[in-house]
């Protein structure tokens, strides 16, 4: 029979031979021959493979540095990576997590739209007409304005984006 | 061309240890398992066991596993099969062997345990 | 161990005609991975062997189209379809499927 130029799934072609891949948790240790099937062994302790393969050496898994404001979300198996996350009050800088930065707060003016988490930073928006924020914050929302009405009061100081109204008292000197 | 070439005979008395050599060229030593198999005369061949070059990985015929040691030394594409506390049966020629894309054979060393 | 069990033990043959070669083993050679590792190489006297046939039927490179192999399971042949002078000499089966590896009795070739 003519060598194969192609093989199934889950093997590889080396010196005319379809050879069996490893599967996910194990490394190549010797490719098939006329005589042998793949010879693959699991990966060690901390290593890992994610996919069917012939490779010759298995992934580190990734270290999650504390100096770094990392810490484990999920433990890497013989198969899968660490998934590291960020410490409180922190986030990933890229999508890979290798490193974190502080959330950023919200200056005045600004309310939180979007609460951070492990992987994405705190989303502000400018406080709307008829909402403030008057301090830097990482969880505020916009407030409303302060209702004078509805205590009976009126509206001595307009608000703005960073300040509350100010109400005062109903001009009793009125007709 | 791939060459598998051998040590030369040697004679020993019986309890005396033997070490055959196995040179490899002409493919990436590391690549291929090398395997040795004997010959005595006027008899069947018999499989000792083989040594993955890339991590001295062994795997034995156990017959053989408690007298026969397998080594490799790549910087000099070497394969090494010693065999300890000899007796008259041991008599044989001894081959390595290399398979995966073809198979080679070495030119085989005789081994003869006389007293 | 896998004992392997080759006739007849000797084949006197007529140059040009055909010639077969048995070979059984005690267990299945069926790999879990689906292939039948049983080989056949040919030994001339004095010389170091050289492969034939792997996984039952296929020729090594260089090896002429007269030498072909069959068979499954336990049961395999060796078949050479025109004898030629220089197929002189010992044939042997063997398995790599069980560890540890073992060989046939082999079979001596001679012509009449």
């Known amino acids: 029979p003519e060598p194969p130029t192609a093989c199934r799934e889950k093997q590889y072609l080396i010196n005319s031979q379809c050879c069996s891949l490893c599967q996910p948790g194990q490394k190549l240790v010797s490719d098939c021959t006329e005589f042998t099937e793949t010879e693959c062994l699991p990966c060690g302790e901390s290593e890992f493979l994610d996919t069917w393969n012939r490779e010759t050496h298995c992934h580190q898994h990734k270290y999650c540095d504390p100096n770094l404001g990392l810490r484990v979300q999920q433990k890497g198996t013989s198969e899968t990576d660490t998934i590291c996350t960020c410490e409180e009050g922190w986030h990933c800088t890229s999508e890979a997590c290798e490193s974190c930065v502080l959330h950023r707060s919200c200056s005045p003016g600004f309310g939180v739209k979007q609460i951070a988490t492990g992987v994405s930073d705190t989303i502000c928006e400018p406080c709307p007409v008829g909402f403030f924020s008057n301090v830097s914050s990482a969880f505020e929302k916009c407030h409303p304005w302060t209702s004078c009405e509805t205590k009976d009061l009126v509206v001595q100081q307009a608000g703005t984006n960073k300040t509350d109204v100010v109400c005062g008292p109903q001009d009793r000197l009125r007709a | 061309q791939v060459q598998l070439v051998q040590s030369g005979a040697e004679v020993k008395k019986p309890g005396a240890s033997v070490k055959v050599s196995c040179k490899a060229s002409?493919?990436?030593?590391?690549?291929?398992?090398i395997y040795w198999v004997r010959q005595a005369p006027g008899q069947g061949l018999e499989w000792i066991g083989g040594?993955?070059?890339?991590?001295?990985?062994?795997n034995f015929n156990e017959k053989f596993k408690s007298r026969a040691t397998l080594t490799v030394d790549t910087s000099i594409s070497t394969a090494y099969m010693e065999l300890s506390r000899l007796r008259s049966e041991d008599t044989a020629v001894y081959y390595c062997?290399?398979?995966?894309?073809?198979?080679?054979w070495g030119q085989g060393t005789t081994v003869t345990v006389s007293s | 161990d896998v004992v392997m069990t080759q006739s007849p033990l000797s084949l006197p043959v007529t140059l040009g005609q055909p010639a077969s070669i048995s070979c059984r083993s005690s267990?299945?050679?069926?790999?879990?991975?689906?292939?039948?590792?049983l080989h056949w190489f040919q030994q001339r006297p004095g010389q170091s062997p050289r492969h034939l046939i792997y996984?039952?039927?296929n020729r090594f490179s260089g090896v002429p189209d007269r030498f072909s192999g069959s068979g499954s399971g336990t049961d395999f042949t060796l078949k050479i379809s025109r004898v030629e002078a220089e197929d002189v000499g010992v044939y042997y089966c063997?398995?790599?499927?069980?560890?540890?590896?073992?060989f046939g009795g082999g079979t001596k070739v001679e012509i009449k």
């Open positions: 062997t290399r398979h995966g894309n073809g198979v080679y």
């Open positions: 002409g493919y990436t030593f590391i690549s291929y398992y």
């Open positions: 040594i993955n070059p890339r991590n001295g990985g062994t």
């Open positions: 267990q299945s050679l069926l790999h879990s991975n689906g292939n039948t590792y």
């Open positions: 996984q039952v039927s």
């Open positions: 063997s398995q790599t499927t069980h560890v540890p590896w073992t």
